[in-house]
């Protein structure tokens, strides 16, 4: 006996109570694939969540986080507080990046400034809490005999930028 349910498209379910007729998903439910025997209830975006995309008969609702928070986890299953650039989120809230580290986003952790000398380069622009250092040419490239179309800015090692 052929399974008639396989003919039911997304947005419908195979209604066993009605001789396997394909019935539309009821309001506030969806089926994203064909051949479903039930429709799933649409996700609701409440509390710390807000609706990014409304539910349709063929796709679930998509949530975002309320202002001041950003999504984490699969399909925005949780929210995390935004911090300012130059900060990171700790158990006690947003804290400024320690000297020698930076964060240029509203999320994530403070990362150490790039160590220019590891690549044989010098510091062209000092790092701040919000920005990484900018590495310039190596000290050897700055020797009097080295040719350069435009003279580079004077290099300073990190450790002297105002916080």
């Amino acid at each position: 006996l052929q399974d008639l349910c396989s003919n039911c498209p997304a947005g419908t379910f195979c209604d066993n109570n009605r001789s396997q007729i394909c019935s539309p998903c009821p309001p506030n439910s969806f089926s994203s694939a064909g051949g479903q025997r039930t429709c799933d209830i649409c996700r609701q975006c409440k509390g710390v969540f807000k609706t990014r995309k409304e539910c349709s008969s063929t796709s679930n609702a998509e949530c975002d986080c309320i202002s001041g928070y950003h999504c984490l986890g699969a399909e925005c299953s949780m929210c995390e507080q935004d911090c300012k650039q130059g900060q990171e989120l700790t158990k006690k809230g947003c804290k400024d990046c320690c000297f020698g580290t930076f964060n240029d986003q509203k999320r994530g952790i403070c990362r150490p400034w790039t160590n220019c000398s590891l690549d044989g380069k010098s510091v062209l622009v000092n790092g701040t809490k919000e920005r990484d250092v900018v590495c310039g040419p190596s000290p050897a490239d700055l020797s009097p005999g080295a040719s350069s179309a435009t003279p580079p800015a004077p290099a300073r090692e990190p450790g002297h930028s105002p916080q």
Epitope: K46, G47, S77
Partner: antibody
Framework: QVQLQQWGAGLLKPSETLSLTCGVY????????WSWIRQSPGKGLEWIGE???????EYNPSLKSRLTISIDTSKNQFSLKLTSVTAADTAVYYC????????????WGQGVLVTVSS | KIVMTQSPATLSVSPGERATLPCRVS??????LAWYQQKPGQAPRLLIY???TRATGVPARFSGSGSGSEFTLTISSLQSEDLALYYC?????????FGGGTKVEIK
């Protein structure tokens, strides 16, 4: 550290109104959702409803017709009123904070046992 | 409403052994699930949210996994202080609903 302290009458007669209040100490009162949850031997944990600082509420449909949750932001308190109680409403009632991270509950009150008996 | 099923109602585990607590959901809820621990006479304590993220201060021996309609709380090495009731809770839909709980006891 956030602390939730709750109080209210523990012994009621059928048809009376259950009234509980939850005080919030520490943390930010105005940026969270606040919930009531009850626990009875027969039904386990049951979410009752929630409110935010603006007074927007969400109620469990099974209790909605008898339920009022209100908030007093000047006192950092929110309250529960459940009318026409019966023995089935006998339970430990908890207030709880809905987390910043998700609609789960990261801080709870100590719980108040409410008994409905004639 | 979404129905949460926790079975078995009681789980007996030897100290130091792994405890695996399942939670089944009546329909797919993505990763919108939390786990709680409740000891006698105390309020529940949040352990896990987002199906797998440990709440602040929760020991690393507690871990959560799963998505959709099948979830698991694992205690990697059971300690005596872990004897308690454990509940799952979904927050995909309102009303928010809890499972009936699994009691973890010493074998």
């Amino acid at each position: 550290q956030v602390q939730l302290q709750q109080w209210g009458a523990g012994l009621l007669k059928p048809s009376e109104t259950l009234s509980l209040t939850c005080g919030v100490y520490g943390g930010s009162f105005s940026t969270n959702y606040w919930s009531w949850i009850r626990q009875s031997p027969g039904k386990g944990l049951e979410w009752i409803g929630e409110i935010n600082h603006s007074g927007n509420t969400e109620y469990n449909p099974s209790l909605k017709s008898r339920l009022t949750i209100s908030i007093d932001t000047s006192k950092n308190q929110f309250s529960l009123k459940l009318t026409s109680v019966t023995a089935a409403d006998t339970a430990v009632y908890y207030c709880a904070r809905m987390g910043y991270h998700s609609p789960s509950f990261d801080f709870w009150g100590q719980g108040v046992l409410v008994t409905v008996s004639s | 409403k979404i129905v949460m099923t926790q079975s078995p109602a009681t789980l007996s585990v030897s100290p130091g052994e792994r405890a695996t607590l399942p939670c089944r959901v009546s329909q797919g809820i993505g990763s919108n699930l939390a786990w709680y621990q409740q000891k006698p006479g105390q309020a529940p304590r949040l352990l896990i949210y987002g199906a797998s993220t440990r709440a602040t201060g929760v020991p690393a021996r507690f871990s959560g996994s799963g998505s959709g309609s099948e979830f698991t709380l694992t205690i990697s090495s059971l300690q005596s202080e872990d004897l308690a009731l454990y509940y799952c809770q979904q927050y995909n839909n309102w009303p928010l609903t809890f499972g009936g709980g699994t009691k973890v006891e010493i074998k």
